[in-house]
Interface confidence: low
């Protein structure tokens, strides 16, 4: 025997209290597939969340984040605070990148500057909190008249040793 509820389209639910009649989803609820026995409550975009797409009888609301925040998680389940370039988000808020590290995004973590000498190259442009070092040609490739910027030696983390 065919389940009578299978005839209920999206936007309705199969109401067992009313002889399995297809009833429209109540306000602020939806069913995105047919044959549902209940409608789901619409997501509400509150606080730091803002509505990107309104809820309809057949689809849930979609949220994004207010300016200064960005989405994390499936379907923007969380909003994480943006930081400025040159900062990273910590439990205590946005903190400037430590010397020798940078972040060129509004999200993510500060990354160490490139060590140009690892590839036998010289530093063409010093790193900043917002930008990585730019490596140039190896010192041997520079003509006698050419000059290169030499940054101060980067601070070493405890436990680091040359390989």
């Amino acid at each position: 025997l065919q389940d009578p509820c299978s005839n209920c389209p999206a936007g309705t639910f199969c109401d067992n209290n009313r002889n399995q009649i297809c009833s429209p989803c109540p306000p602020n609820s939806f069913s995105s597939a047919g044959g549902q026995r209940t409608c789901d409550i619409c997501r509400q975009c509150k606080g730091v969340f803002r509505t990107r797409k309104e809820c309809s009888s057949t689809s849930n609301a979609e949220c994004d984040c207010t300016p200064g925040f960005h989405c994390l998680g499936a379907g923007c389940s969380m909003c994480e605070q943006d930081c400025k370039q040159g900062q990273e988000l910590t439990k205590k808020g946005c903190k400037d990148c430590c010397f020798g590290t940078f972040n060129d995004q509004k999200r993510g973590i500060c990354r160490p500057w490139t060590n140009c000498s690892l590839d036998g190259k010289s530093v063409l442009v010093n790193g900043t909190k917002e930008r990585d070092v730019v490596c140039g040609p190896s010192p041997a490739d520079l003509s006698p008249g050419a000059s290169s910027v030499t940054p101060p030696a980067p601070a070493r983390e405890p436990g680091h040793s040359p390989q």
Partner: antibody, heavy 116, light 111 residues
Framework: SRSLVESGGGLVQPGGSLRLSCTAS????????MQWVRQAPGKCLEYIGT???????YYASSARGRFTISRPSSKNTVDLQMNSLRAEDTAVYYC??????????WGQGTLVTVSS | DVVMTQSPSSVSASVGDRVTITCQAS??????LSWYQQKPGKAPKLLIY???NLASGVPSRFSGSGSGTDFTLTISDLEPGDAATYYC?????????????FGCGTKVEIK
């Protein structure tokens, strides 16, 4: 939509060379650290190297000398040039957006087979 | 190069169990560590970045902790879909050495 697609894989003889390309859609590749990783059949993931957003390159010691990572300025790609290939270089090669960011991305991989 | 040592190499657990995987770095990598899940024939999927941050779309059953040289991935309330191989990766590209290395994986099987 945003994606990474590797290309250039295939069969190559021992001692030969191959250039793999990774093309980005939906974002600018030069804004991110990009890495190449490989995986031999049934083996662990192996890091090859990274090109930073500033254009600087790091290599694993096992890749230094034979492999070169570059980012052609005219294209939204990152390339992996592989020379003096050996049978043990047979693997699936992946490019990936560095996972230090909260929105990572990996390509589907391209198979390189080194065999005579 | 930094060397990542992962353990155990495999673990068999039941649905609903808590599984803990550890990863040890040969040198101090602060919190520059990521955890990946890989299923056969698929590219790795990022679970955790910066040692303890949940990547986009990853269930909160997965959690990461640690800093310096010792790191842990915990899967609580194990589900059948969690059967996979899990890898740690150093993402520290330091002034003294190249990071990037992966551990050699932990295969999680469901009993």
């Amino acid at each position: 939509s945003r994606s990474l697609v590797e290309s250039g894989g295939g069969l190559v003889q021992p001692g030969g060379s191959l250039r793999l390309s990774c093309t980005a859609s939906g974002f600018t590749i030069s804004s991110y650290h990009m890495q190449w990783v490989r995986q031999a059949p049934g083996k662990c993931l192996e890091y090859i190297g990274t090109i930073s957003s500033g254009g600087n390159v790091y290599y694993a010691s096992s890749a230094r000398g034979r492999f070169t990572i570059s980012r052609p300025s005219s294209k939204n790609t990152v390339d992996l040039q592989m020379n003096s290939l050996r049978a043990e270089d047979t693997a699936v090669y992946y490019c990936a957006r560095d996972s230090g960011y909260s929105d990572p991305m990996w390509g589907q991989g391209t198979l390189v087979t080194v065999s005579s | 190069d930094v060397v990542m040592t992962q353990s155990p190499s495999s673990v068999s657990a039941s649905v609903g169990d808590r599984v803990t995987i550890t990863c040890q770095a040969s040198q101090n990598i602060r919190t520059y560590l990521s955890w990946y899940q890989q299923k056969p024939g698929k590219a790795p999927k990022l679970l955790i970045y910066a040692a303890a941050n949940l990547a986009s779309g990853v269930p909160s059953r997965f959690s990461g902790s640690g800093s310096g040289t010792d790191f842990t991935l915990t899967i609580s309330d194990l589900e059948p879909g969690d059967a996979a191989t899990y890898y740690c990766q150093s993402t520290y590209l330091g002034t003294d050495y190249v990071g990037g290395a992966f551990g050699c994986g932990t295969k999680v099987e469901i009993k």
